[in-house]
Interface confidence: medium
Amino acid sequence: LEASEEVELEPCLAPSLEQQEQELTVALGQPVRLCCGRAERGGHWYKEGSRLAPAGRVRGWRGRLEIASFLPEDAGRYLCLARGSMIVLQNLTLITGDSLTSSNDDEDPKSHRDPSNRHSYPQQAPYWTHPQRMEKKLHAVPAGNTVKFRCPAAGNPTPTIRWLKDGQAFHGENRIGGIRLRHQHWSLVMESVVPSDRGTYTCLVENAVGSIRYNYLLDVLERSPHRPILQAGLPANTTAVVGSDVELLCKVYSDAQPHIQWLKHIVINGSSFGADGFPYVQVLKTADINSSEVEVLYLRNVSAEDAGEYTCLAGNSIGLSYQSAWLTVLPEEDPTWTAAAPEARYTD
């Protein structure tokens, strides 16, 4: 069976009502399309008594049973019932191809239309089922990230997959954190990659008929230390009503442990700045946080005096970053305004 060919029951018209039970063997990864009745009045498909939804990987749609890529869990009994009645139009059992005994290469692929036979497909060398997902050959990722390589394939008999690194069998035993091999997903996963993970990774897919391989290149980029990065737009200018509670956010990214301070800008003797040119500030909150967490300044029961400029200051061993936002406090009890999250004022 060609990789692109679909399985189709003939005829795709109203079948006879004396429908015999059929068994159909499908190779893993194979697309399936089974027809039942006329397209505009096709029957409803059921699997093991449950009606199939019209959308999804396995779907019953306009009289068709469609399976994008046959998986082991798709095996089972399928019924097609005429609309508005319980008349069985199709009654068949799908069997996974990996339980097949090999059949001859010259077997007529259309022989599966004879309902009296148990059907199997000719042997087939492995082929890629989703080559479009394999187009990204070079993976350049920062150290610490997770990498996933996939080589989804099919064939008859069902092929096996193994992985090589730089041409040598790769099981990950020498790798800190090991690897995850998910054979049913044809994937290799490596978490928290380090520079020593760089190399050429080969998936080798093979069965009794033949083998195919594909190379991925992995480059691990070493992080250069940097001062904290603050998420754009945070903290955000905020408008609140007297008596309400306000939460100002500052999202900090830092490889080195960051130190966070929340500052409120204040006025002393009519001036916002001291003789040294730095603004007058009051430290409201200080914290050390783990990277990638949200840091929040929580103001309860705000009053007019809470209005003003607030700054999130984040520092690590490399340097400082800070961004500011304005809090406006309105006197109305029930605001009709909309606080539309304007961009924060950047002072970095």
């Epitope: 029961n301 606080a339 539309a340």
Partner: antibody
Framework: QVQLRESGPGLVQPSQTLSLTCTVS????????VSWVRQPPGKGLEWMGV???????TYNSLLKSRLTISRDTSKSQVFLKMNSLQTEDTATYYC????????????WGPGTMVTVSS | NTVMTQSPTSMFTSVGDRVTMSCKAS??????VGWYQQKTGQSPKRLIY???NRDTGVPDRFTGSGSGTDFTLTISNMQAEDPAIYYC?????????FGGGTKLELK
């Protein structure tokens, strides 16, 4: 642990006033705001209003004319009163607590079903 | 009022699938968005706050992302206990508003 529980009449006559109580435990109403949210049968969620830690309130403008939210901090209770009820006010009514410095509606009560019918 | 539009309104999925649902705000709401899961007969449970922060005890297969007007909730590996209605909420401007919900069902 944090708990909220709504209570009130299951059936209210049209044009009457609905009175619900949200009794809380595991936290103080002076530190966390509490909202009321309702959900008509088979429909989505609608925010009704909030009582803030200082005791002031903010209401959904669609319900403001009919709604009053108040509290008794000593009894750890928040109250909802809504007048001029109609059949479309039939819903499950929930009270929900803010997350402190971690967002809104972090904890919910189990809800109480209110049917408006004669 | 800020309208939160969720899509799809319902979807069928299988255990192990990757599921993605969307919430679009009619105006910029920053990251003032939460995601809630409501199972039949239960009160809503918060999964995500501030658009991308997972609540304590929520499995790491749930991920929130987005800012401004476009937000996404992803379930990386659908489990049998995940069928529910999922709501997004904006608390950026009054009145706070929920999306209409996405009903997630198993095939």
């Amino acid at each position: 642990q944090v708990q909220l529980r709504e209570s009130g009449p299951g059936l209210v006559q049209p044009s009457q006033t609905l009175s619900l109580t949200c009794t809380v435990s595991g936290f103080s109403l002076t530190f966390y705001h509490v909202s009321w949210v309702r959900q008509p049968p088979g429909k989505g969620l609608e925010w009704m209003g909030v009582i803030w830690t200082g005791g002031s309130t903010t209401y959904n403008s669609l319900l403001k004319s009919r709604l009053t939210i108040s509290r008794d901090t000593s009894k750890s209770q928040v109250f909802l009163k809504m007048n001029s009820l109609q059949t479309e006010d039939t819903a499950t009514y929930y009270c929900a607590r803010g997350g402190g410095d971690r967002g809104y509606f972090a904890f919910w009560g189990p809800g109480t079903m209110v049917t408006v019918s004669s | 009022n800020t309208v939160m539009t969720q899509s799809p309104t319902s979807m069928f999925t299988s255990v192990g699938d990757r599921v993605t649902m969307s919430c679009k705000a009619s105006q910029n709401v920053g990251i003032n968005v939460g995601w809630y899961q409501q199972k039949t007969g239960q009160s809503p449970k918060r999964l995500i706050y501030w658009a991308s922060n997972r609540d304590t005890g929520v499995p790491d297969r749930f991920t929130g992302s987005g800012s401004g007007t476009d937000f996404t909730l992803t379930i990386s590996n659908m489990q049998a206990e995940d069928p529910a209605i999922y709501y997004c909420l904006q608390h950026n401007s009054y009145p706070w508003t929920f999306g209409g919900g996405t009903k997630l069902e198993l095939k």
